[in-house]
Amino acid sequence: TEETIKFAAAHYNTEILKSIDNEWRKTQCMPREVCIDVGKEFGVATNTFFKPPCVSVYRCGGCCNSEGLQCMNTSTSYLSKTLFEITVPLSQGPKPVTISFANHTSCRCMSKLDVYRQVHSIIRR
Amino acid sequence: TEETIKFAAAHYNTEILKSIDNEWRKTQCMPREVCIDVGKEFGVATNTFFKPPCVSVYRCGGCCNSEGLQCMNTSTSYLSKTLFEITVPLSQGPKPVTISFANHTSCRCMSKLDVYRQVHSIIRR
C-alpha cells in the first residue's frame, strides 16, 4: 500500500496533501506526555492510595505506518516524583514518598518480532 | 483523607508541596491531544486502510480525585479531516476521503452513576 501512495498523485488538491502530511507529523511515534495511575503502575496493595493518584510522564505513543510495527521506547530516563501515600485504615497521616518513574526519551517504530525479542532479552537478563 | 492532607500539609517542605500541586495540575481531567486509530474508531472493513492510519484529536483524559469518579466530556465539537482511503485489492489508487472526528472541548470528573445515566440517555434518544 505504501507504493500506491507514491504513484497515485494526479490532481490532488495540494492543501489536502499538506493537511495529510501534517496529520502524519502530529501522530508520529514519539514520547508523549501521559497520565500514569501510580497504583496500577506499581501494583500496590488495595488499601494504599496516592495523592495525586496520577503522575505526568513521557511514554512512547502515536502510530506507525504499518500493522506489523509497534511504537516502542529506545531510550528511557527515570524521574523521581514525591507524592503523598495514604494507607487505610489511617494509622498515621499522609506520608511523602519519592517514587521513580520510567520516562521515555526516544521512540521508534519496531517490528513486533523485534519488540518480542527485546522484551525477552530484558527478561532473560 | 482530603482533610488529613490539608492539616498535614503545614509540616511539609514547601518544595514538595509545590511539586505535588504541579502534579495535580498536569494530571487533571481535561481535553488532551491523542492519536486515534481511524479504522478502530469507525470499525471499518478489514480490507480498508487509511493513510495516515491515525489522526490527532482532543479527548478527555487525566485523573480524578476519587475511585468513584470518571473523566468525561461535557462538550464536543467535530473536526473534519481528509485522509487517503485504500481498499485492497487495489481497484483504484488511494482516494481522499473527509471524515468527521469527535473532539472533546471540555471535561469533568463525573460519578460513574452519572456517566452511566448520560450514556444511556444518549442511547435512548
Partner: antibody
Amino acid sequence: EVQLVESGGGLVQPGGSLRLSCAASGFTFTDNWIHWVRQAPGKGLEWVGVISPYSGATYYADSVKGRFTISADTSKNTAYLQMNSLRAEDTAVYYCARDADYDYAGWAFDYWGQGTLVTVSS
Amino acid sequence: DIQMTQSPSSLSASVGDRVTITCRASQDVSTAVAWYQQKPGKAPKLLIYSASFLYSGVPSRFSGSGSGTDFTLTISSLQPEDFATYYCQQSYTTPPTFGQGTKVEIK
C-alpha cells in the same frame, strides 16, 4: 543560510539510469517539502515530483511516473531523484527546490539549487 | 492537468515603464499562484506567492493580484535588473504547472 546543492548530472544513453542528489543545509530538512523541477534547453519549467522528507510521501508528474523515484535520507539531509528508462525528452537542467511552506493552499518554491544538466543521447 | 497561459510571450520595455504580465488558468485555482523571475543560466527566484503576497527581500515595485482563473504580475517601474523571463505557476492541484514564460527585453 539555506542552501540546496544538486549533483549527479551527466550524459547517459537512452534507456539508461542516473541518480541525482540534492544536499540541503541551513534549515530543518523534515520541515519542508522538496520538489524536483526541470527545464529543457531553451524551454520553460516543468514540475517533476515532490517528497515530504518527514513522512516519505511522494507525488509525481505523469510524464515520469513509474520511471523516476524520489527518496530522502533524513540522516544526510539529502533528497534523491532516481531516473530509470531515460528518454531523449528527459534532457534538461534538473533543479531541486524547497517548498516555502506558507500557510496557504499551494506550493511555492522559495529556494532553488543551481541545477544539474542531464543529457540523454546515444 | 491545469494549463497556465501567460501573455504576452515577450515584451520590450524601457527602464521606468510599468509592465503587466497576465496569466490565465484553465480552471479555478483559488489564489494558489506564484510568480518567478529567471535570468539566463540561473535558477528561478520566487517573487510572489499566494497570488498577491510579496516574498521576503523582493522589491516592492513587484506586485501580484487575482484569484480564480485570472492573475497579474505588475512591475510598477522597470529597473535594469528586471530584464528577465517571468513564469507563473499554479499549485492548487497536483501536478503544479507553469506558464510558458514571458521574456521582458530592453526596448
